[in-house]
């Protein structure tokens, strides 16, 4: 009887299992009993990526250096195109199609995590003891100015946009 | 045991027709896909046509095509080529063969088609 | 079509040697080849199939190997019964076609 299901990388045509091409490859011609599948090489500038029987490879991705991005890793025949964005930009989605600026932390708010190719600024509230007087897409919460290792006392008080101001301990005579 | 046994050569000439048969015993004839392949005096082996097994597609060389038909029945075991506008270069000892996993793999002993005048 | 080109078109060996025919295809068949064996007044025999797969009951002083363009029939220790006339055929386009043929005689 003829075949109903075929084996992995083939496929089912005309009662028959033909081979499927293979990545880098596309099918030019159907396998018949007397002859195997036909397969030619994608060309430049294209790929395919699974076994397959696509009649067209697919173009390689073009990173627009308009929308800010690069190439971080040529295509190949197997491979599309990997891009990323210019330093101080990061991708809008994780296909990477455009890039926008780096978000910067404002006053109040340090970097927890500084900006890649593929992901925002992550900024958190300086917590109780740190501050952030600048809006920067690299800067921490600094901690407040220990006035006491200084032998100083705190003369105003720290919040999470200005450090804590230290003047000269009062002398009793 | 397999066996393919071809018939119906003879002399013809040029223009003329010939109808070639190739009788199969020893196997499920329908399961297997079948082929004509010719050897010219003096020359190598040259494939002229074939027919699938289940969807029965036909295939032929560029140097028959539109000439030579290909056909099967399968109820006979029977193999077929019908010959037409036959030329001189069409001589030759015509070979039945079965196919599995695109190779020959029994071959009948062949029948010779001289196109002469 | 696809051109199949052997060589040498003829060999002449003795029992006991080791003899290698080559077979050149005019563009990429992958590993789609068979070899055949062919003596006078006889059906040609399937030796090899996908360019390295000994077909049943051949000896397996019988070896292929290739891919791409590049193809060789090796016999290992040539016996009496092996002087014949060796074919490759290619099956990776549409028609299949076979090599001109390699005699391999008695020297």
């Known amino acids: 009887e003829p075949p109903t299901a075929c084996r992995e990388k083939q496929y089912l045509i005309n009662s028959q299992c033909c081979s499927l091409c293979q990545p880098g490859q596309k099918l030019v011609s159907d396998c018949t009993e007397f002859t195997e599948t036909e397969c030619l090489p994608c060309g430049e500038s294209e790929f395919l990526d699974t076994w397959n029987r696509e009649t067209h490879c697919h173009q390689h991705k073009y990173c627009d250096p308009n929308l800010g991005l690069r190439v971080q890793q040529k295509g190949t025949s197997e491979t599309d195109t990997i891009c990323t964005c210019e330093e101080g930009w990061h991708c809008t989605s994780e296909a990477c199609e455009s890039c926008v600026l780096h978000r910067s932390c404002s006053p109040g708010f340090g970097v927890k995590q500084i900006a890649t190719g593929v992901s925002d600024t992550i900024c958190e509230p300086c917590p109780v003891g740190f501050f952030s007087n600048v809006s920067s897409a690299f800067e921490k919460c600094h901690p407040w100015t220990s006035c006491e290792t200084k032998d100083l006392v705190v003369q105003q008080a720290g919040t999470n946009k200005t450090d804590v101001v230290c003047g000269p301990q009062d002398r009793l005579r | 045991e397999v066996q393919l046994l071809e018939s119906g050569g003879g002399l013809v000439q040029p223009g003329g027709s010939l109808r070639l048969s190739c009788a199969a015993s020893g196997f499920t004839f329908s399961s297997y896909a079948m082929s004509w392949v010719r050897e010219a005096p003096g020359k190598g082996l040259e494939w002229v046509s074939g027919?699938?097994?289940?969807?029965?597609?036909?295939y032929y060389a560029d140097s028959v095509k539109g000439r030579f038909t290909i056909s099967r029945d399968n109820s006979k075991n029977t193999l077929y080529l019908q010959m037409n506008s036959l030329r001189a270069e069409d001589t030759a000892v015509y070979y039945c063969a079965r196919y599995v996993n695109f190779g020959m793999d029994y071959w009948g002993q062949g029948t010779l088609v001289t196109v002469s005048s | 079509d696809i051109q199949m080109t052997q060589s040498p078109s003829s060999l002449s060996a003795s029992v006991g040697d080791r003899v290698t025919i080559t077979c050149r295809a005019s563009q990429s068949i992958s590993s789609y080849l068979n070899w055949y064996q062919r003596k006078p007044g006889k059906a040609p025999k399937l030796l090899i199939y996908a360019a390295s797969s000994l077909q049943s009951g051949v000896p397996s002083r019988f070896s292929g190997s290739g891919s791409g363009t590049d193809f060789t029939l090796t016999i290992s220790s040539l016996q009496p019964e092996d002087f014949a006339t060796y074919y490759c055929?290619?099956?990776?386009?549409?028609?299949?076609?076979f090599g001109q043929g390699t005699k391999l005689e008695i020297k």
């Open positions: 027919i699938g097994s289940y969807g029965g597609g036909t």
């Open positions: 055929q290619q099956y990776g386009r549409n028609p299949p076609t």
